[in-house]
């Protein structure tokens, strides 16, 4: 079982390979000096049907370096960054993992593109492995709450309460959504 020639790349190069390209072979892409690689640099020859070989993902692309490009902080509810830090310049990558009891859909890494957007794929999503969700928490008088998403919230996520200036928070500042679908505490209050 072998793979066909790896997809070509403009303004870059492909690592050395011999033919036939055996299943398990890795080829690596890199870009010429004034270009930045967007996408996974390594492709793997795999077989899905034990008959034909195929490349496990599309080839990355080489974008002409834009020194003015910068991307916003990428947010993945239920997930966290394991690689990458601000500022995010053209060609920088960020890799995500999901919190405990969440599973990832999509590609774990994204790249800052010349158009100031993350790509070449969408940001991954972290989905709760528990079907239960916690109901939306109420707002509190003279205060606010920040949640990682709107409406009902998946186990493992949390809501943080804060009070307006001149008010004191009484109770728990951070309330966690438990795997039982219940909140870890009742909402706090803001008192003068």
């Amino acid at each position: 079982i072998s793979c066909g020639s790896p997809p070509p790349i403009l303004n870059g190069r492909i690592s050395y390979y011999s033919t036939p390209i055996a299943v398990g072979t890795v080829i690596r892409y890199s870009c010429s000096g004034t270009f930045r690689l967007i996408g996974e640099k390594s492709l793997l020859c795999i077989t899905k049907d034990k008959v034909d070989g195929t490349w496990d993902k599309p080839a990355p692309k080489c974008e002409y370096f834009n020194k003015y490009s910068s991307c916003p902080e990428p947010i993945v509810p239920g997930g966290y960054k394991i690689r990458g830090s601000t500022p995010y310049r053209h060609g920088d990558s960020v890799t995500f993992a999901c919190k405990t009891n969440f599973s990832m859909n999509g590609n774990k890494s994204v790249w800052c593109q010349a158009n100031n957007m993350w790509g070449p794929t969408r940001l991954p999503t972290c989905v709760s492995v528990f079907p239960l969700e916690c109901p939306a928490l109420p707002m509190i008088h003279n205060g606010h709450h920040t949640s990682e998403n709107v409406g009902s919230i998946a186990p493992g996520l949390s809501v943080t309460y804060s009070c307006e200036s001149g008010y004191l928070l009484v109770g728990e500042k951070i309330i966690n959504c438990l795997s039982s679908g219940k909140w870890s505490a009742v909402p706090p209050t803001c008192e003068e």
């Epitope: 690592s15 398990g24 793997l44």
Partner: antibody, heavy 119, light 106 residues
């Protein structure tokens, strides 16, 4: 950091086989590749082969083709290297090493397993 | 197989001084090169990958450079714990290691 713990030292007769295990803990076993690298006494490092556990794909260095078999058990996060038709020059420390995804370089190494081939 | 050649085989340097280790590839390997440090009785430890990127937790005194066929590992100011054997490894086409450079105290 992923920890790789290998099985203990082995003494084998020429012509026999040896099977060394490498148990991974931490990280996701399915998201990395495990290579086997050996080091004869006082010598350098020699790549033997590699497996991608999630796919069950193993590839071997030309020198060891037909004599080495690398397998993985996803349920126990353990990789195995079996070397057959042992000869005295196979006496070495055998290491398992992990590369994240298919990066090509080894972030984590097992502690090594000494295999001595002697009559 | 891509043959990797390291030089010198042994390098004698005094603590506090700079050490420069070389690695040559038998064919172009772009920047697909890693450096490892190995002390007696221990497994190798990743220092540098992609020719010049320091691995997590590696001190700034270690730096890597080069591309194509010529690569260098530089240790700017040698500490006592840096005396060890150093290996380069290519991953352009499968994997292969250099024969090692032993860095010893002068």
């Amino acid at each position: 950091q992923v920890q790789l713990v290998q099985s203990g030292a082995e003494v084998k007769k020429p012509g026999s086989s040896v099977k060394v295990s490498c148990k991974a803990s931490g990280g996701t076993f399915s998201s990395y590749a495990i290579s086997w690298v050996r080091q004869a006494p006082g010598q350098g490092l020699e790549w033997m082969g590699r497996i991608i556990p999630i796919l069950g794909i193993a590839n071997y260095a030309q020198k060891f083709q037909g004599r080495v078999t690398i397998t993985a058990d996803k349920s126990t996060s353990t990789a195995y290297m079996e070397l057959s038709s042992l000869r005295s020059e196979d006496t070495a420390v055998y290491y398992c090493a992990r590369e994240e995804d298919i990066s090509g370089y080894y972030q984590d190494w097992g502690q090594g397993t000494l295999v001595t081939v002697s009559s | 197989e891509i043959v990797m050649t390291q030089s010198p085989a042994t390098l004698s340097v005094s603590p506090g001084e700079r050490a420069t280790l070389s690695c040559r590839a038998g064919q172009s390997i772009s920047h697909y090169l890693a450096w490892y440090q190995q002390k007696p009785g221990q497994a190798p430890r990743l220092l540098i990958y992609d020719a010049s990127t320091r691995a997590t937790g590696i001190p700034a005194r270690f730096s890597g450079s080069g591309s194509g066929t010529e690569f260098t590992l530089t240790i700017s100011s040698l500490q006592s714990e840096d005396f060890a054997v150093y290996y380069c490894q290519q991953y352009e086409y499968w994997y292969s290691f250099g024969q090692g450079t032993k860095l010893e105290i002068k």
